[in-house]
């Protein structure tokens, strides 16, 4: 997260880290005791999933292996459309005050809605600085029409934009797959942005979760 702040401890109990060994690979969101939602471009053969801590690499955090993941069948590496994936945990999460599932959206929030994005991604770009603490940024949803003025053909129909005018605050490498939460519901998953990160007036781009609720529910049901 560029130009963000340290999240209030315990305020994001659904936030998970997908680790490759001990290294951060992506963010993710707990949606069920067996399931984590993340970005399709975060796909690996297997994952170590850290839950229940704001500190990356916290020894006291829950760590669960995951060997199965289900990318959206329409995901494109070229256009990043349908950048959404479900990761099935090998064993169920122990729910607590520190580990909770996020609320999936009942509706799509409108432009102008205030939201918070979080992650352990680099806080500087192009030179990288990875924080140990979970970082947050407060952003507002931007209409597709406004966002298309910036990204034109790069912006797909199920992509959601968020940012703050003239501000550098944005997501960056390592934040991918993490949550954009608006009014206590999951509205976005970090998908992409421009590189180097933090270009003013280049919104962050997210997978619009409200458009995928049926796919999420059906995939979890099929592979339970």
């Amino acid at each position: 997260i560029i130009d963000g702040y340290k999240c209030k401890e315990g305020s994001h109990p659904w936030q998970v880290a997908l680790l490759k060994g001990n290294q951060l690979h992506c963010g993710g969101v707990l949606v069920d005791k067996y399931w984590v939602l993340t970005a399709a471009h975060c796909k690996m053969g297997q994952y170590q999933v850290q839950l229940g801590s704001d500190k990356i690499g916290d020894q006291s955090a829950q760590k669960i292996k995951a060997t199965k993941s289900f990318r959206h069948p329409g995901y494109s590496t070229k256009t990043h459309v349908n950048d959404i994936m479900l990761v099935r945990l090998d064993e169920p999460v122990k729910m607590s005050s520190k580990v909770e599932a996020v609320q999936l959206p009942e509706h799509c929030e409108p432009p102008g809605t205030s939201c918070t994005v979080s992650g352990w991604g680099t806080t500087t770009s192009p030179d990288v600085t990875f924080p140990s603490d979970l970082m947050c940024s407060d952003v507002k949803l931007i209409s597709s029409r406004e966002c298309k003025k910036v990204y034109k053909d790069l912006l797909g129909k199920t992509m959601l934009c968020a940012g703050i005018p003239d501000s550098k605050t944005n997501t960056c490498n390592g934040d991918s797959g993490g949550p954009l939460v608006c009014n206590d519901t999951l509205q976005g998953l970090v998908s992409w942005g421009t590189y180097p990160c933090g270009q003013p007036n280049d919104p962050g781009v997210y997978t619009q979760v409200c458009k995928y609720k049926r796919w999420v529910m059906e995939t979890m049901k099929t592979h339970r």
Partner: antibody, heavy 122, light 107 residues
Framework: QVQLQESGPGLVKPSQTLSLTCTVS??????????WHWIRQHPGKGLEWIGY???????YYNPSLKSRVTISVDTSKNQFSLKLSSVTAADTAVYYC??????????????WGQGTLVTVSS | DIQMTQSPSSLSASVGDRVTITCQAS??????LNWYQQKPGKAPKLLIY???NLETGVPSRFSGSGSGTDFTFTISSLQPEDIATYYC?????????FGGGTKVEIK
């Protein structure tokens, strides 16, 4: 279809400034996510990245050339330019302009100009 | 700067042969690795992006693999039109850097 076309003098005298312009057609230089680069290739050798400019005017130069390079953009003409000062014979090369899709998830040069040979000689 | 070491610098193979080129990065670049083909007197052309993704319109005999520091580019069945120099390029960190190139010739 995006096209890039380099233009400028093919011969520059030592100690002078090399100036090249790249004209972009079929796409807007103001589009977010696309950066505009200069790359050169010495005769019979490999590719050397010089630097880029973004729609906002944000630039980044190769540290090895930074003190001599300036890249600028003219969005109204859909052009970007390279200036390389205090040239020597070692700057003789084919100069390419290129577009890069440059996202957090994916970055690559997808369109290139055909290249222009610049010879530094008195 | 990240150094990209490409090998071999040149190779000669027969039509129909499988050709493999390797590229090693001096540090972890994840999958930010691209492959380009350059024919004499022409600009480089993108073949593979993000280590393993085939650019639109590029024949399927070209492929790429790898992650981290070690990458491979393969032509499954060499064709006469594949005579060119091939370059790897890292896009993980600035400045972007290229490998030294591999000149592919027909025996």
């Amino acid at each position: 279809q995006v096209q890039l076309q380099e233009s400028g003098p093919g011969l520059v005298k030592p100690s002078q400034t090399l100036s090249l312009t790249c004209t972009v057609s079929g796409g807007s230089i103001s589009s977010g996510g696309y950066y505009w680069h200069w790359i050169r290739q010495h005769p019979g050798k490999g590719l050397e990245w010089i630097g880029y400019i973004y729609r906002s005017g944000y630039t980044y130069y190769n540290p090895s050339l930074k003190s001599r390079v300036t890249i600028s953009v003219d969005t109204s003409k859909n052009q970007f330019s390279l200036k390389l000062s205090s040239v020597t014979a070692a700057d003789t090369a084919v100069y390419y302009c290129a577009r890069a899709k440059q996202l957090t998830t994916s970055r690559y040069f997808d369109y290139w100009g055909q290249g222009t040979l610049v010879t530094v000689s008195s | 700067d990240i150094q990209m070491t490409q090998s071999p610098s040149s190779l000669s193979a027969s039509v129909g042969d499988r050709v493999t080129i390797t590229c090693q990065a001096s540090q972890d670049i994840a999958n930010y690795l691209n492959w380009y083909q350059q024919k004499p007197g022409k600009a480089p052309k993108l073949l593979i992006y993000d280590a393993s993704n085939l650019e639109t319109g590029v024949p399927s005999r070209f492929s790429g693999s790898g992650s981290g520091t070690d990458f491979t580019f393969t032509i499954s069945s060499l064709q006469p039109e594949d005579i060119a120099t091939y370059y790897c390029q890292q896009a993980s960190d600035l400045p972007f850097t290229f490998g030294g190139g591999t000149k592919v010739e027909i025996k």
